[in-house]
Interface confidence: low
């Protein structure tokens, strides 16, 4: 049940041994009583005990004091338990008879004569207080207290609610007075089954089985799961969200592996020559005069550099050169010419004006040609006019930039990006190429928009050769070998001259 | 005293709507999640709605959920149910209660309770 109504009989007297008919009992009246608990009636009325009833063993004869007794026959205080919500009113029948018959029993022995009744109706709050009252009528009188109170596990102002400590699967938590739940250390909820984690752990990125723990999710990582993982292989980059690998500055491809500031990084040009950010390596050195080779470490001899103009031919000293000039020319480097507009020495369709009052002439050279007798054609590359890496070539009378991946435009100073329209699945990384967006897969997907779910690890037969580093999660076939200098192909098996600007996706 | 004082109930054609008050007295409000329960004729008690103490978390009966929106203002110790889309089977008088114990749909027993308003949909 949900409460017990408990009736402590205290003392009975009936001085005269009288019974409520005016008779008297023969020797004494043998006392027992029957108690009836029903709701709350304004007039009480004959009809079944609602609330519960309960009759006690012969108690004394006549006066009497009854003693507390917690068990067996006789029990004192009596209990009347109920289970429904107490609803705070009641009415209470205490009736005292005379019985000739068993002491034990003697609500079924006949002739059972009433000796009084009291009747008390009001209301009565759960709690652990006894109410204590004393009622006469002109023969008798009785002291008695009565109180309700809740049974284990039920809790309030009415008994109403159910309440069980627990400290498993389904909840941790003790009971409050009010029967509401307090939760254990370390649990939250409604029902205390959702443990507190870690202080401080994230709540997307983490998640706790058990109080004081913080688990990270796939792509997380630290004390608090506040620190994205970047993608397998990223060498120069960082992430805001898993798997990303945003490049550091001075740092690009695909892995943040490519030195974009080869030049400050390395100094790699020697002899005073000048180093650009370009070129299949990543950087390019123009030699000064004299000087030669990748790194312009290599000394030419002095005549290398052709200082003689105008068809002069060089000869080699110890620490110089001497030019030999050709007819009409004259000066050190051959610079000077006696010649004029009347000899023809304009090259390739130049115009000749004469200078000097006809002493000498200038030539003005069609496009495409240069020098002082237009006999040079342009190199149109060697104002570097490609950007962002883009690879000079000489195309007839023009010049076209070829540019590096994710670059267009005619000087390659456009950049394009396919990655706008979130073309990757699964939290795959986006990268701009020539012929379109690649993307770099997390852990466990591959396919070229990370669409194909793997559960093997495609790199681990060793499929590259040549040193080439392998990656998986890029393409259908799960790997991507991106390969050394000097090799290409799927698999880096080819040696080439010249390594491609991308490294082949298998 | 405790007091629980329900308002704002009437005769509804099917389709209108109405709006319940419940003013509280003589205990701290704010302290208590609060509820609604009705009861039809010749029917027990129906939980219709709760809310929590702070007014962020709210919960409905599967027959009222997206129909009636319950609210409660601290500062003004009431608590209010918006009713829409009214049909006859709301008819029923309406309590405010406070929730003591909870099922796994809502709340099941009640600590204090209104006297309650009659809201009677019919054309």
């Known amino acids: 049940g949900s409460g017990i109504f408990q009736l402590r009989l205290q003392e009975f007297v009936n001085q005269r041994g009288m019974l409520a008919n005016g008779q008297s009992c023969e020797p004494g009246c043998r006392t027992f009583f029957r108690i009836c608990l029903k709701h709350f009636q304004a007039t009480f009325s004959e009809g079944p005990c609602t609330f519960g009833n309960v009759s006690t063993p012969v108690l004394g004869t006549n006066s009497f004091v009854v003693r507390d007794k917690n068990s067996g026959s006789g029990r004192n205080p009596l209990q009347l338990p109920f289970n429904f919500t107490w609803p705070g009113t009641f009415s209470l029948n205490i009736q005292a008879w005379h019985t000739p018959g068993d002491d034990l029993r003697p609500e079924t022995s006949p002739g059972n004569s009433l000796i009084s009744q009291i009747i008390i109706q009001g209301s009565l709050a759960v709690g652990k207080i006894w109410r204590t009252d004393e009622q006469n009528d002109t023969l008798t009188r009785l002291s008695y207290s009565y109180r309700v109170i809740c049974s284990d596990n039920y809790y309030g102002e009415s008994c109403s609610r159910l309440c069980k400590k627990r400290d498993d699967h389904f909840g941790h938590y003790e009971c409050q007075p009010d029967g509401s739940l307090s939760c254990l250390p370390g649990w939250t909820g409604k029902y205390c089954d959702q443990p507190i984690c870690l202080s401080g752990c994230h709540e997307q990125n983490g998640y706790c089985s058990k109080p004081d723990e913080c688990i990270c999710r796939p792509g997380w990582q630290g004390r608090l799961c506040n620190e994205c993982i970047p993608h397998n292989g990223c060498r120069h980059g960082t992430c805001s969200i898993p798997w990303q690998c945003a490049c550091d500055e001075g740092w690009g491809g695909l892995f943040c592996d490519q030195d974009l500031n080869y030049c400050t990084h390395h100094s790699p040009c020697k002899n005073g020559s000048t180093c650009s950010n370009s070129g299949p390596k990543g950087y390019t050195c123009t030699c000064l005069p004299g000087y030669t080779g990748e790194h312009c470490e290599l000394g030419l001899s002095k005549c290398a550099s052709n200082p003689c103009r105008n068809g002069g031919s060089c000869k080699d000293q110890e620490n110089s050169y001497h030019c030999l000039c050709p007819p009409g020319y004259y000066g050190q480097h051959c610079e000077h010419s006696t010649l004029t507009c009347a000899d023809s020495p304009c090259f390739n369709g130049g115009s000749c004006r004469e200078r000097n009052q006809g002493s000498s002439y200038a030539c003005e050279c069609p496009p495409n040609f240069t020098g002082s007798n237009c006999e040079k054609k342009v190199d149109r590359c060697t104002s570097n006019p490609c950007a962002n890496g883009g690879q000079c070539q000489n195309r007839g009378p023009s010049r076209t930039c070829r540019c590096r991946p994710g670059f267009t435009g005619t000087h390659c100073e456009l950049h394009i990006s396919d990655c706008a329209r979130s073309p990757c699945a699964h939290g795959g990384t986006c990268h701009d190429l020539e012929n379109g967006p690649v993307c770099t897969c997390p852990a466990g997907f591959s396919g070229r928009r990370c669409e194909v779910r793997i559960t093997h690890d495609a790199c681990a037969s060793g499929p590259c050769f040549n040193g080439a580093t392998c990656y998986t999660g890029l393409s259908p076939n799960n790997f991507v070998c991106n390969c050394p200098y000097g090799f290409v192909g799927s698999r880096c098996e080819f040696p080439v001259g010249l390594p491609p600007s991308f490294p082949w996706v298998a | 005293e405790v007091q629980l004082v329900e308002s704002g109930g009437g005769l509804v054609q099917p389709g209108g709507s109405l709006r319940l008050s419940c003013a509280a007295s003589?205990?701290?409000?704010?302290?208590?999640?609060m509820s609604w329960v009705r009861q039809a004729p010749g029917k027990g008690p129906e939980w219709v709605s709760a809310?929590?103490?702070?007014?962020?978390?709210?919960y409905y009966a599967d027959s009222v959920k997206g129909r009636f929106t319950i609210s409660r203002d601290n500062a003004k110790n009431t608590l209010y149910l918006q009713m829409n889309s009214l049909k006859p089977e709301d008819t029923a008088v309406y309590y405010c209660?406070?929730?003591?114990?909870?099922?796994?749909?809502?709340?099941?027993?009640?600590?204090?309770w209104g006297q309650g308003t009659q809201v009677t949909v019919s054309s």
């Open positions: 209660a406070t929730p003591r114990g909870w099922g796994p749909t809502g709340p099941h027993e009640y600590g204090y």
């Open positions: 003589g205990f701290t409000f704010g302290n208590y999640d």
């Open positions: 809310i929590n103490s702070g007014g962020g978390d709210t």
